[in-house]
Amino acid sequence: LTCLGGFASPGPVPPSTALRELIEELVNITQNQKAPLCNGSMVWSINLTAGMYCAALESLINVSGCSAIEKTQRMLSGFCPHKVSAGQFSSLHVRDTKIEVAQFVKDLLLHLKKLFREGQFN
């Protein structure tokens, strides 16, 4: 699920239903955001690489009491093969950089879109 680039000929392959739903949820969050997401909570930035789903979950799981991202947290847990709990960090975190949840979600969405488009466009 984490390998999206380099689609085989003749064209791109659509995502699994789970990944499609994750992308749609990220789109909903970014498009429907009015007040600061999660009251402007800050999370650790991550390296958007092969283990990004677990890293994203490890970062977002430290945000509590924010209903807007609860569905995203549940979805990400489905992509991460190991159990993730608050306070847990992997080497994929950029531990010196914290960003707002809204920016984190936007970055994750942009990265997923980029991966799909790399397989689609010349």
Partner: antibody, heavy 119, light 107 residues
Amino acid sequence: QVQLQQSGADLVRPGASVTLSCKASGYTFIDYEIHWMKQTPVHGLEWIGAIDPETGGTAYNQKFKGKAILTADKSSSTAYMELRSLTSEDSAVYYCTRILLYYYPMDYWGQGTSVTVSS
Amino acid sequence: DIVMTQSPATLSVTPGDRVSLSCRASQNISDYLHWYQQKSHESPRLLIKYASQSISGIPSRFSGSGSGSDFTLSINSVEPEDVGVYYCQNGHSFPLTLGAGTKLELK
């Protein structure tokens, strides 16, 4: 609200080229792909190709490679389609549409541009 | 290329009728199937996405079903304003392809 405003109808000579425009508003232009469709009574709705406005990357239907050239200008939120070496077969209504990612539906369409190729 | 076949080509209905429009893909496209309505002299408009998901602003009388290669668009009580051509679209793989359409007309 989201709008895709297309350029007006064109009457062009065989062998000539024409450039159609599609100006997007009401959303962030680089967040969505722009896809182009051709509609004729004989062939119905055909997908010509798509462009990622952020990178300028393109994807074409093999049938329209060499016929259509897709470009986009981020600064004006406008996508363009140049049609080359026109023949009567290119007479059609052309639509621009937006799609988040290629497997998504075409959720907004332009009003269409009628192109007539005639001497 | 994935070929999308729609039937019937034309459907003559009476207001209040329940109608079903069929779309068949030449290969398995899972639920990557979208439906559009095009009224005379208008652009197409999205009715249903991913075979069965409703679209905001579209009347609830429109519904979709199916998966794999066989799909159906249903209108549970046709209104006079539903007259037009209905297209199904393969969203699974390039090139994106559409059916030839089903024309819905009033008797």
